[in-house]
């Protein structure tokens, strides 16, 4: 089948070749930083990825075997010779952006380990995809009226019902532990993050562990890049100054044909610090054109609440590789310097592996002082990764995308 991903163990055939598009809580990851048990599903089969022992209550695991002892293979095995996460990423195919459910929920993609979840604070949080259900029972999800998990807490906090959507790398880097609401029903909180598609199909390794992706990287896919979300140490004063910066022109995504219309409602109103993120499944499937639809994102510095209402960004089926191009968008908050170096929001026509399990989104948030602002994805490479240094909106979108993958256990 698909050629084994380089990094993976004999991932025989196509194992690594699948584009993760449309993943939904199929088993994706969502890292809740503080959340105990944030599963770093994103950590792909890191050698260190010791499966959480079943006995430990695993978030979302309705039934965890008490007996499974990580085998040397599982724990120490370089998970399929997956080199460093970055390596894997490179090997992985662009996975499509989840359309709605998180990979974890769907049971596809990396399998987050509860342990990872526990390691939730791991700065480099890999995308831990948690099933919407939190990888657990289906019915435990806390959902909005529409049944979709909604996240209204600052990213740092994983709302209870939030199942980490596929690889919702919601690794609030040390944001003041927002009320960590454990993923409801043990399922990894879905943060709606969908950026890294590490589909839950493969349990991710513990977040703190070496994060070599356990997923075989699809040989055919472009390498995924580790999205390092670096949040510069924020001091209250600096945060303020940033908030005051002039609105950063958002890339014009008008041409995004697909269902992405959802960015239209994003309003970034930095200010108070409340981040209200309402995630609806991001259906990015058909963002064929080169993203041009951030056109309606309103960045209203000042205000206070960041209310991001993402409706399904339909990246679903094929935001294939054009994503590579958020790479240069750098939002440099600070006296108004906003550099948008290249807005090519080109969502690669099938940002396949990049989002879910391709780009491992590493959130490095240096000393965050009381800052609950959304973490920024950085370096989500062209393989579908979104390289957003400080663009909360983009980060949010990415998050949503990843989150949706987790559901399906992919």
């Amino acid at each position: 089948m698909a050629e084994p991903r380089q990094e993976f163990e004999v991932m025989e055939d196509h194992a690594g070749t699948y584009g993760l598009g449309d993943r939904k809580d199929q088993g994706g990851y969502t890292m809740h930083q503080d959340q105990e048990g944030d599963t770093d599903a994103g950590l792909k089969e890191s050698p260190l990825q010791t499966p959480t022992e079943d006995g430990s209550e695993e978030p979302g695991s309705e039934t965890s075997d008490a007996k499974s002892t990580p085998t040397a293979e599982d724990v120490t095995a370089p998970l399929v010779d997956e080199g460093a996460p970055g390596k894997q990423a490179a090997a992985q195919p662009h996975t499509e952006i989840p359309e709605g459910t998180t990979a974890e929920e769907a049971g596809i993609g990396d399998t987050p380990s509860l342990e990872d979840e526990a390691a939730g604070h791991v700065t480099q949080a890999r995308m831990v995809s948690k099933s919407k259900d939190g990888t657990g029972s289906d019915d435990k999800k806390a959902k909005g009226a529409d049944g979709k998990t909604k996240i209204a807490t600052p990213r740092g906090a994983a709302p209870p019902g939030q199942k980490g959507q596929a690889n919702a790398t919601r690794i609030p880097a040390k944001t003041p532990p927002a009320p960590k609401t454990p993923p409801s029903s043990g399922e990894p909180p879905k943060s709606g993050d969908r950026s890294g598609y590490s589909s839950p199909g493969s349990p991710g390794t513990p977040g703190s562990r070496s994060r070599t992706p356990s997923l075989p990287t699809p040989p055919t896919r472009e390498p995924k890049k580790v999205a390092v979300v670096r949040t510069p140490p924020k001091s209250p004063s600096s945060a303020k100054s940033r908030l005051q910066t002039a609105p950063v022109p958002m890339p014009d995504l008008k041409n995004v044909k697909s269902k992405i219309g959802s960015t239209e409602n994003l309003k970034h109103q930095p200010g108070g610090g409340k981040v209200q993120i309402v995630y609806k499944p991001v259906d990015l499937s058909k963002v064929t054109s080169k993203c041009g639809s951030l056109g309606n994102i309103h960045h209203k510095p000042g205000g206070g609440q960041v209310e991001v209402k993402s409706e399904k960004l339909d990246f679903k089926d094929r935001v294939q590789s054009k994503i590579g191009s958020l790479d240069n968008i750098t939002h440099v908050p600070g006296g108004g310097n906003k550099k948008i170096e290249t807005h090519k929001l080109t969502f690669r026509e099938n940002a396949k592996a990049k989002t879910d399990h391709g780009a491992e989104i590493v959130y490095k948030s240096p000393v965050v002082s009381g800052d609950t602002s959304p973490r920024h994805l950085s370096n989500v490479s062209s393989t579908g990764s979104i390289d957003m240094v400080d663009s909360p909106q983009l980060a949010t979108l990415a998050d949503e995308v990843s989150a949706s993958l987790a559901k399906q256990g992919l």
Partner: antibody, heavy 117, light 108 residues
């Protein structure tokens, strides 16, 4: 090479339970979700649920909630599916299938275990 | 079945056959589709994943696509060995689980 090997056929009486195993080899067991899908004679495929092989977390189809239990033993890279309170309509071939990591689908399947009630 | 497929389809060698798979906004409309081929007496085999991706080893005669809430599978240059049952599957947001089509038996 990736291989999912399931346990042998089972014949059970109504009300009993059956536990099917799926021994995995050729890849890092904990790196993938394991799904269980069944197929009644002459019928189509029906998804039962999945287990995160790494954490043990599970997700079951509503239809099977309360009757199915999926577990795994990472030390022997084996996933298990136990179905209780068996009824005649549970007679089917039960498959374990690995959730794709980089795509949307089930990339590898076990050969199936026929359970006759 | 949540996803609807025609029970059967047939064609002669060399022909092109298309199998439809229709669903709704909560499944195909918002999630990627995968296709499986199940030869008599064997386990299903992944044929198409993520709407239109072919695992290595699958002939390019098989192609998948997705438009709205429908995801057809096309088999061009039909061959005798293609005689099999084909199933489409995707995640359903409402049911919160994977759903399959009822299967289509292709006869060559």
């Amino acid at each position: 090479q990736v291989n999912l090997r399931e346990s042998g056929a089972e014949v059970k009486k109504p009300g009993a339970s059956v536990k099917v195993s799926c021994k995995v080899s050729g890849y890092t067991f904990t790196g993938y979700y394991m799904h269980w899908v069944r197929q009644a004679p002459g019928q189509g495929l029906e998804w039962m649920g999945w287990i995160n092989s790494n954490s043990g977390a599970t997700k079951y189809a509503q239809k099977f909630q309360g009757r199915v239990t999926m577990t795994r033993d990472t030390s022997i890279t084996t996933a298990y599916m136990e179905l209780s309170s068996l009824r005649s309509d549970d007679t089917a071939v039960y498959y374990c299938a690995r959730g794709a990591r980089d795509g949307y689908g089930f990339d590898y399947w076990g050969q199936g275990t026929l359970v006759t009630v | 079945y949540v996803l609807t497929q025609p029970p059967s389809a047939s064609g002669t060698p060399g022909q092109r056959v298309t199998i439809s798979c229709s669903g709704g906004s909560s499944n195909i409309g918002s999630n990627a589709v995968s296709w499986y081929q199940q030869l008599p007496g064997t386990a299903p085999k992944l044929l198409i994943f993520t709407n239109d991706q072919r695992p290595s080893g699958v002939p390019d005669r098989f192609s998948g696509s997705k438009s709205g809430t429908s995801a057809p599978l096309a088999i061009s240059g039909l061959q005798s060995e293609d005689e099999s049952d084909y199933y489409c599957a995707t995640w359903d947001d409402s049911l919160n689980g994977w759903v399959f089509g009822g299967g289509t038996k292709v006869t060559v």
